[in-house]
């Protein structure tokens, strides 16, 4: 029997390479049974995850799963960092794994670093 707990399917240690100035949608895949839970996004600052209050979000519904989307329109250099979604379900807080955005600022980067350079040498993001 399938569990009716809410589950947040952000992949563990997932990473995204994105360009400043581009639009980007960060998806939080949500599985639920009956009532859609209240889901929020936060951005990690050290060990604290700061709730993103004034950001554009939306839901996308598919057959077996729903997506709570955080919109970046456009991506800004300071959007670089790790994000997490969380859901309130039956008085419980369910937290996703964090997902990391590596933002390349096209104005200051003469050549776009590879995804692996950004993962292993994050200072490239701030040149």
């Amino acid at each position: 029997k399938e569990s009716c707990d809410v589950q947040l399917y952000i992949k563990r240690q997932s990473e995204h390479s994105i360009l400043a100035g581009d639009p980007f949608e960060l998806e939080c895949p949500v599985k639920y049974c009956a009532n859609r839970p209240h889901v929020t996004w936060c951005k990690l600052n050290g060990t604290t995850c700061v709730k993103l209050e004034d950001r554009q979000t939306s839901w996308k519904e598919e057959k077996n799963i729903s997506f709570f989307i955080l919109h970046f329109e456009p991506v800004l250099p300071n959007d670089n960092g790790s994000y997490r979604c969380s859901a309130n379900f039956q008085s419980n807080l369910i937290e996703s794994h964090s997902t990391t955005l590596y933002v390349t600022d096209v104005k200051s980067a003469s050549e776009r670093p590879s995804k692996d350079e950004m993962a292993s040498r994050p200072w490239l993001l701030y040149r």
């Epitope: 589950q7 399917y9 992949k11 563990r12 240690q13 997932s14 990473e15 995204h16 390479s17 794994h97 964090s98 995804k115 692996d116 993962a119």
Partner: antibody, heavy 120, light 112 residues
Framework: QVQLQESGPGLVKPSGTLSLTCADS????????IHWVRQPPGKGLEWIGR????????RYNPSFKSRATISSDKSKNQASLKLSSVTAADTAVYYC?????????????WGQGTTVTVSS | DIVMTQSPDSLALSLGERATINCKSS???????????LNWFQQKPGQPPKRLIY???KLDSGVPDRFSGSGSGTDFTLTISSVQAEDVAVYYC?????????FGQGTKLEIK
Amino acid sequence: QVQLQESGPGLVKPSGTLSLTCADSGFNIKDTYIHWVRQPPGKGLEWIGRIDPANGFTRYNPSFKSRATISSDKSKNQASLKLSSVTAADTAVYYCAREDGYPYYTLDAWGQGTTVTVSS
Amino acid sequence: DIVMTQSPDSLALSLGERATINCKSSQSLLDVDGKTYLNWFQQKPGQPPKRLIYLVSKLDSGVPDRFSGSGSGTDFTLTISSVQAEDVAVYYCWQGTHFPRTFGQGTKLEIK
């Protein structure tokens, strides 16, 4: 049923490029990570790297960083490995493996492996 | 890189004896999510590795309960309570917490 199947040339010339494909069935690769692991004759297992097929983001073992390229094709449900400037030391059995998703994140399914010999 | 050191490199036991394989990591494998991504694989000649144990102690489906895993932080153990002929194989630990992922060098189990 989850299956992974590696394929590619069994013989590669020194200084050439090794190219392998991992054809996956029974699951959607974009929901997982695909890893490549190799095993030289009579030796242990060596992790080469992994890809997130959902967005193409890769991670490599620094030992292979400059020579390895992992890619994926969601439409074909397959992943690929290219290893450039090969030498005899790259002779090995090459495996692709799936990292299952929530909540365990471990290599739960492997291909049978394909033997690659580097020789002129 | 995280170095995974297994001991012993090989062991030869009689049928029914207890096998203990140790794996030591150079750093803690406890992840930020509170889980420890330490796995054990069994590899028989001419076959790909097969997952036996994940998250330190969870047994894969179909794996006999004579296999067990334990440990935390940097020290882990695979135990076979009563070795059977079909357990002859090489056993590898693997860490999935840090990049790059790393395997132990392997422990070869033989029957005396």
